[in-house]
């Protein structure tokens, strides 16, 4: 019962997490114009992975997609890749985990098969969560770098007479959605892995070494027997890689009306 609950909860948490990763990837607010300590402007700029938008005080919002692939910063491409890999792995993981759910009967599927599928989906969720967290973190790191760079030369004067105020960008809502969603997917994956251990049928492991004496067929079995509880030394710890990178964001931007500026 506890195993079923753990598996079910893991699935639900992962489902919410993956939905969040998809939402974050599609959102336009990855970076938003920093309003603190800046002159009050009648426009509000914000940028996503796929397009950048400008919301005017008038009520108009204009968004422009990044219609180039080669002209985009490598780090933006890297973040896109990490998020898409995260979504794909998560979607496959969800598909696998549906069939692995203990409460769902599919033909005469053995518990061992369900356990393997649960473990597979769990690992997929963990990697998916890590991809999302890595992608969002890379973008955040890039924002921090660019923020301080633009702060250092915030006013670029022409002979000290005319001033051009540089638009600084700070963390957008999508980053927080991505971090939370990635974390949830990761937690869901861990729960699936824990559930897998409880699903695995009881096994007996015999580690035998045969010694052949001349003229006799005697087998010596050292170490006796070890009953596998599912938590014994037979379980392998897999190390999940943590993708890392650095980012750069340089982007630009039809109308919907929302209140903002």
């Amino acid at each position: 019962m506890a195993v079923t609950a753990c598996q079910g909860l893991g699935f639900v948490v992962s489902l919410i997490g993956i939905a969040g990763i998809i939402a974050a990837t599609c959102m336009d607010q990855w970076s938003t114009q920093d309003l603190y300590n800046n002159p009050v402007t009648a426009v509000f700029n914000y940028q996503g992975l796929w397009r950048s938008c400008v919301r005017e005080s008038s009520g108009f919002t204009e968004c422009r997609g990044y219609f180039t692939l080669l002209g985009l910063p490598a780090m933006l491409q890297a973040v896109r890749a990490l998020m898409i890999v995260g979504i794909v792995l998560g979607a496959i993981g969800l598909l696998v985990s549906i069939f692995a759910l203990k409460c769902i009967r599919i033909g005469s599927m053995e518990d061992s098969a369900k356990a393997n599928m649960t473990l597979t989906s769990g690992i997929m969720f963990i990697v998916s969560g890590l991809c999302a967290i890595a992608g969002v973190s890379v973008f955040a790191n890039m924002l921090v770098t660019n923020f301080w760079m633009s702060t250092a030369n915030m006013y670029t004067g022409m002979g000290g007479m005319v001033q051009t105020v540089q638009t600084r960008y700070t963390f957008g809502a999508a980053l927080f959605v991505g971090w939370v969603a990635g974390g949830l997917t990761l937690i869901g994956g861990v729960m699936m892995c824990i559930a897998c251990r409880g699903l695995a049928p009881e096994e007996t492991n015999y580690k035998a070494v045969s010694y052949h004496a001349s003229g006799h067929s005697v087998a010596y079995k050292p170490g006796g027997f070890k009953a596998s509880t599912g938590f014994g030394s037979n379980t392998k710890n897999k190390k999940i890689y943590d993708g890392g990178a650095r980012t750069e964001d340089e982007v630009q931007s039809y109308p919907s009306k929302h209140d903002y500026v």
Epitope: T41, N45, V54, T164, K257, Y260
Partner: antibody
Framework: EVKLVESGGGLVQPGGSLKLSCAAS????????MAWVRQAPRKGPEWVAF????????YYADTVTGRFTISRENAKNTLYLEMSSLRSEDTAMYYC???????????WGQGTLVTVSA | DIVMTQSPSSLTVTAGEKVTMSCKSS????????????LTWYQQKPGQPPKLLIY???TRESGVPDRFTGSGSGTDFTLTISSVQAEDLAVYYC?????????FGAGTKLELK
């Protein structure tokens, strides 16, 4: 057709109060930012106040901050400007304007005259 | 506050003549997000409210004759009337639509010779 009609202007003594109204029609009022602009006799226009479509953002010109209050009632398609502690320099034609692309004042009313005099 | 400086303050022209007026802002009105300049030009005739001519420094409002052209970027802007007509005699104002307060220039008065 976009139509903006201002009302509420008149003669008022210095230190007095007045409330201007602007009735809007011909567009979805709650979709657009609105502003008040005034023009003193033989002078150029002067932006007074701005209110965003859902009234989350409100800005005032330094000369009127603390004395004037802009508000809107989207259900009634009406924009207001409440003026208090009026001074002689507030004498002007007050226009209501609807913002358009580029934050331009795309549509203007015919104005209502406010005269502050003893 | 952003200071908008218009020049000349008045212009005396003859019908059919090409006219150019200038507007300078104390800070750049270019928004990096969409690479658009938030400067607007208005025309005001006596006893009437100002009428929108050009927004985003160079985009003509619908219904505005194509003899009116806006140009410029950053801090320096120009309004050009390719062939002045009698009905164009008015005061022309530029406005900063980027920073609050949304300041206007003092205007350029177009008069007939």
């Amino acid at each position: 057709e976009v139509k903006l009609v201002e009302s509420g202007g008149g003669l008022v003594q210095p230190g007095g109060s007045l409330k201007l109204s602007c009735a809007a029609s011909g567009f979805t009022f709650s979709d657009y930012g609105m502003a008040w602009v005034r023009q003193a006799p033989r002078k150029g226009p002067e932006w007074v106040a701005f209110i965003s479509n859902l009234a989350y953002s409100i800005y005032y010109a330094d000369t009127v901050t603390g004395r004037f209050t802009i508000s809107r009632e989207n259900a009634k398609n009406t924009l207001y400007l409440e003026m208090s502690s009026l001074r002689s320099e507030d004498t002007a034609m007050y226009y209501c304007a609807r913002l358009g692309r580029g934050n331009s004042f795309a549509y203007w009313g015919q104005g209502t005259l406010v005269t502050v005099s003893a | 506050d952003i200071v908008m400086t218009q020049s000349p303050s008045s212009l005396t022209v003859t019908a059919g003549e090409k006219v150019t007026m200038s507007c300078k802002s104390s800070q750049s009105l270019l928004n990096s997000g969409n690479q658009k300049n938030y400067l607007t030009w208005y025309q005001q005739k006596p006893g009437q409210p100002p009428k929108l001519l050009i927004y985003w420094a160079s985009t003509r409002e619908s219904g505005v004759p194509d003899r009116f052209t806006g140009s410029g970027s950053g801090t320096d802007f120009t309004l050009t009337i390719s062939s002045v007509q009698a009905e164009d005699l008015a005061v022309y104002y530029c406005q900063n639509n980027y920073y609050y307060p949304l300041t206007f220039g003092a205007g350029t008065k177009l008069e007939l010779k």
